[in-house]
Amino acid sequence: EAHKSEIAHRYNDLGEQHFKGLVLIAFSQYLQKCSYDEHAKLVQEVTDFAKTCVADESAANCDKSLHTLFGDKLCAIPNLRENYGELADCCTKQEPERNECFLQHKDDNPSLPPFERPEAEAMCTSFKENPTTFMGHYLHEVARRHPYFYAPELLYYAEQYNEILTQCCAEADKESCLTPKLDGVKEKALVSSVRQRMKCSSMQKFGERAFKAWAVARLSQTFPNADFAEITKLATDLTKVNKECCHGDLLECADDRAELAKYMCENQATISSKLQTCCDKPLLKKAHCLSEVEHDTMPADLPAIAADFVEDQEVCKNYAEAKDVFLGTFLYEYSRRHPDYSVSLLLRLAKKYEATLEKCCAEANPPACYGTVLAEFQPLVEEPKNLVKTNCDLYEKLGEYGFQNAILVRYTQKAPQVSTPTLVEAARNLGRVGTKCCTLPEDQRLPCVEDYLSAILNRVCLLHEKTPVSEHVTKCCSGSLVERRPCFSALTVDETYVPKEFKAETFTFHSDICTLPEKEKQIKKQTALAELVKHKPKATAEQLKTVMDDFAQFLDTCCKAADKDTCFSTEGPNLVTRCKDALA
């Protein structure tokens, strides 16, 4: 229903704490360079204004849309053009064009320093002094680096952060309590970020229909006992929630997500037997829990899929009468029977089924034509299964770091024109799939691997879109979202690439590498590895292994030497010569 004052309505629904958090996230995601203090000031002004509207919905400007109110605040920031360039042109537009202009200027790779965690004592001191400001800084720093982060989920992670600090800052050894717990939250939040970015990409490029299909498949896997009408209702609501967040309507998004969680908990009987534990939790934890709830037990008496979708004499009639509904039913029925498949695979199968019906229903004898459709799914199913087996075997053999290096070589050969930092970031993220998925039970591996890889490759596509350099990457990124991963997997060495000249300085290292944290050391070595491949794209795995082993030995020796600088300056050039010879 329509409210006299949208801002008063959302403030009342969400409560002051969540309202302020969401407004801070919104501002930080739109204007990513502004400081926390600048945004905090705006948030306070907006909150004070919201309170006046709660007191009197007819007060001046209370009837304005949220985008108008927020946009006016952002456009009033001094030096907007100096700091943000052409984004300032958005302020010449009216709503809703202005908001969509802001959205299109969000930067997926802002030039901000990595979010460094202060040491434990300092963190606990500032947390105890002012928990609200401390958590505000967290929301601001994450939101500006991840401008599409799912806002209500970010509130959940901030709550987790808060609980960890409350617990660990009371311990004697704060460091050993905080580090593993905060590392865990960081890892989960980063995965959440790339997954949500993929959802927004899907909405941006392919629209509501594509996202809703994704939601139907995912929900059908999780809730195989829910009927098609229930799944459709949930998918429609989930699409609306995600669309709102991707569109910058964060207050509406959080409010509607809470409504959806409430609906699910009130209708457990028709949705799933696994929801009660989630439903007992407070709001943010409840919604998070529901989003990753375990699959319900599949009904025992499900008939074979062929009955309604291959053997039925009315297949073409049913399809012609309501194409979207018929295909939606197929996706639902297939997905609920296959929690062991990735959503991407399920969508590829539905697409294959649709193409088959389009072709066969126009022929003289449709049943003879589409009769073999399920058998034709086989190669589509085998391909990702083989991918999982091959890659998990490799991961188990090499460990995470070695597996990342293998992927780095592979992807540098596929797209050597891509910048080395992007290749290293992509390979490190792709390589984490091993740790994340390969240790899971067999029936959970495929969905974990493929849907995670798809999200990471979406980021590769977004970064490449900014500065397109590789025809291979452009080709894979131009197709549909579900075909991207198979496309990247199928890429081979780029034969059009002219190898980079060998530059000694690229492989020259100094003693400062010795004091770097392990992660930074790995990145330095992986940067060198990518550069080696760019110099010799057809180097064999054996040659590259020889060089990298030599390199590791060199670092180990010089970092243990009494005079590190001398060791690096004398042994370094020898290493470069040996590398050149090994790759000759």
């Epitope: 809703p96 064009e97 969509e100 959205l103 299109q104 927004c200 909405m203 941006q204 490029k205 392919f206 629209g207 509501e208 229909r209 594509a210 669309k243 991707c246 569109h247 194409k323 979207d324």
Partner: nanobody, 125 residues
């Protein structure tokens, strides 16, 4: 393929009303979003309003809110733009457009795959 044809434009006095119609033929299913854009001489094409086939959700440019109303008739495959209290600054060629996928950004012309040929609206003072 979808074909769009607009009609109903014309010359009107400031403060007057016009009703634009857009006839859609071809496959338009529930996923479609229909939009109205306008282009004044020497200016960029500007978003005016949009409506979803599926749920009838609407959105408007701030300067036309309260004056213009978008509506649809699913059975007839028609979309309408009722324009009241017209102002000289509303003078432009008005285009009907269709986005078959209801993509995220509804004010961006590039997200609409199908366009009508346009109908001229002139508001004299």
């Amino acid at each position: 393929e979808v074909q769009l044809v607009e009609f109903g434009g014309g010359l009107v006095q400031a403060g007057g009303s016009l009703r634009l119609s857009c006839a859609a033929s071809g496959r338009t299913d529930s996923a479609y979003r229909m939009g109205w854009f306008r282009q004044a001489p020497g200016k960029e094409r500007e978003f005016v309003s949009a409506i979803n086939w599926s749920d009838g959700r609407t959105v408007y440019l701030d300067s036309v809110k309260g004056r213009f109303t978008i509506s649809r008739d699913n059975a007839k495959n028609m979309v309408y733009l009722q324009m009241n209290s017209l102002k000289p600054e509303d003078t432009a060629v008005y285009y009907c457009a269709a986005d078959p996928d209801s993509r995220l950004y509804y004010t961006v012309p590039q997200n609409y795959d199908y366009w009508g040929q346009g109908t001229q609206v002139t508001v004299s003072s």
